[in-house]
Amino acid sequence: MMTGTIETTGNISAEKGGSIILQCHLSSTTAQVTQVNWEQQDQLLAICNADLGWHISPSFKDRVAPGPGLGLTLQSLTVNDTGEYFCIYHTYPDGTYTGRIFLEVLESSVAEHGARFQIP
């Protein structure tokens, strides 16, 4: 019987060019975590395997960093990074738990741009 629950950062937003930490936490179970997959809709981003450790997909090596913990850091964000992200916990003996995060990547704020200009 699967008793665990996954807590995630939920819906989050970040600015284009910045970075964001995706975090999930599995609680209320004593099951052993054998692997965590981080996936973006239809793409594998990275896995953290109990034996192998962290492994980042070649498609994302230049802008994904492992951690903190079992989380994942996305860097150099673009608007194309907007969308659903999934943390998939493979556990024994429970099976698979899945958490969902929605990330919205925003253009830099008007206020930030405005600060660069002096009002005459």
Epitope: T34, N37, E39, D42, L44, S57, I88
Partner: nanobody, 116 residues
């Protein structure tokens, strides 16, 4: 679950070539990372090369320019073309794969021996 079957290992002379194959079956939908690791006697297991469904690749520095990884998505099969083999390439080569939402799966290993 995913099953991996490797083939193509054997004995080859220094400077020779071999081609390894890794065929995946079972739950093989979505994106994947497929690759080859190797382990020489008394040494740590190390990544040799890997490829994604979209064709992005990554190589260990020690094999760049000599080894080429490729894949046939329609067959869920990855290939490792090994050229200019050296005695230090002697190892058991393991195929590994992770498919979307699935666990990491290992093949049984195939021995590559480079010797004159």
């Amino acid at each position: 679950e995913v099953q991996l079957v490797e083939s193509g290992g054997g004995l080859v002379q220094p400077g020779g070539s071999l081609r390894l194959s890794c065929a995946a079956s079972g739950r093989t939908f979505g994106d994947y990372i497929m690759g080859w690791f190797r382990q020489a006697p008394g040494k740590e297991r190390e990544l040799v090369a890997e490829i994604t469904r979209s064709g992005r690749t990554n190589y260990a520095d020690s094999v760049k320019g000599r080894f080429t990884i490729s894949a046939d998505n329609s067959k869920n099969t990855a290939y490792l073309q090994m050229n200019s083999l050296k005695p230090e390439d002697t190892a058991v080569y393991y195929c590994a794969a992770v498919f979307s939402r699935g666990p990491l799966t290992w093949g049984q290993g195939t021995l590559v021996t480079v010797s004159s």
